[in-house]
């Protein structure tokens, strides 16, 4: 297993609709054809997997149908979008990239993107 540098923004504020997008960029040492991207969430020192996708270079990322993540790839960059976020989902979202094929296997883990999520203010009741 060889190490690889992964860069991602430090802080992102999700939209009022609970959507956060960020780029995860990896310094590919070679010409990988198969890449796996995993998003991990760290909150209160617990780490959980949010979503994962394996893709062939030049193809779209395919997450599971019920995943809250979508993404696109361009060269050594993966543009990740996480939706359906609420205030309780605020936390550090870590991008993990694995170059699966061809060998050698490379692994890179970013420092994480702190995603802040603000629940929208409830609309005041109105009489019709």
């Amino acid at each position: 297993c060889k190490a690889m540098h992964v860069a991602q923004p430090a802080v992102v504020l999700a939209s009022s609709r609970g959507i956060a997008s960020f780029v995860c960029e990896y310094a590919s040492p070679g010409k990988a054809t198969e890449v796996r991207v995993t998003v991990l969430r760290q909150a209160d020192s617990q780490v959980t997997e949010v979503c994962a996708a394996t893709y062939m270079m030049g193809n779209e990322l395919t997450f599971l149908d019920d995943s809250i993540c979508t993404g696109t790839s361009s060269g050594n960059q993966v543009n990740l979008t996480i939706q359906g976020l609420r205030a309780m989902d605020t936390g550090l979202y870590i991008c993990k990239v694995e170059l699966m094929y061809p060998p050698p296997y490379y692994l890179g883990i970013g420092n994480g993107t702190q995603i802040y999520v603000i629940d929208p203010e409830p609309c005041p009741d109105s009489d019709f």
């Epitope: 802080v11 992102v12 702190q114």
Partner: antibody, heavy 117, light 108 residues
Framework: QVQLVQSGAEVKKPGASVKVSCKAS????????ISWVRQAPGQGLEWMGW????????NYAQKLQGRVTMTTDTSTSTAYMELRSLRSDDTAVYYC??????????WGQGTLVTVSS | EIVLTQSPGTLSLSPGERATLSCRAS???????LAWYQQKPGQAPRLLIY???SRATGIPDRFSGSGSGTDFTLTISRLEPEDFAVYYC?????????FGQGTKVEIK
């Protein structure tokens, strides 16, 4: 080193607007947020809101909603805070601060805004 | 809104003494999102502690933070002359982010 340098002191009349700038250096500007905090004379710190430089999303304190706008110019690594319809109780030192994962660091040197007729 | 109440309002101590500052939240705060700042007259605040207990870069080890839930503490083990200042806690756990009203540590 990481540094935030703010614009100079301003004197404004009630009802006017003020726009304070905060120039960042020593780090990747788009990777962090910028928060604004004010401090009235002899008082404590009041959080005004912040902007996620990466995507331009903002979160304002409710009491200032509609009067405050926070923006950035990524080409010059500068953040701006505009406060409109100024009142005498807006007289304060206004600080910008870099927002990290769970901290404000560093802070700008502060900009005194005086609202007086 | 989460209200942070700091106590005491003023702490009168001598250099070399131990200072214990309290910050109590009106609702539970994730310890990941509680910070402490120091402010001296005419200066901008300076980050001391983040994540309730992690010291910021360049902060001497006489400063320590602890606590969870609604009760947090900043401790200065041995006061140095340069430590006499106002100290603020802040929470980022829930919007709006809020500061405590401050504790002034003054020379006795």
């Amino acid at each position: 080193q990481v540094q935030l340098v703010q614009s100079g002191a301003e004197v404004k009349k009630p009802g006017a607007s003020v726009k304070v700038s905060c120039k960042a250096s020593g780090y990747t500007f788009t990777s962090y947020g910028i928060s604004w905090v004010r401090q009235a004379p002899g008082q404590g710190l009041e959080w005004m809101g912040w902007i996620s430089v990466y995507n331009g999303n903002t979160n304002y304190a409710q009491k200032l909603q509609g009067r405050v706008t926070m923006t950035t110019d990524t080409s010059t690594s500068t953040a701006y805070m505009e406060l409109r319809s100024l009142r005498s109780d807006d007289t304060a030192v206004y600080y910008c601060a870099r927002v990290g994962a769970n901290w404000f660091d560093p802070w700008g040197q502060g900009t005194l805004v005086t609202v007086s007729s | 809104e989460i209200v942070l109440t700091q106590s005491p309002g003023t702490l009168s101590l001598s250099p070399g003494e131990r200072a214990t500052l309290s910050c109590r939240a009106s609702q539970s705060v994730s310890s990941s999102y509680l910070a402490w700042y120091q402010q001296k007259p005419g200066q901008a605040p300076r980050l001391l502690i983040y994540g309730a207990s992690s010291r910021a870069t360049g902060i001497p080890d006489r400063f320590s933070g602890s606590g969870s839930g609604t009760d947090f503490t900043l401790t200065i083990s041995r006061l140095e002359p340069e430590d006499f200042a106002v100290y603020y806690c802040q929470q980022y756990s829930r919007s709006p982010w809020t500061f405590g009203q401050g504790t002034k540590v003054e020379i006795k």
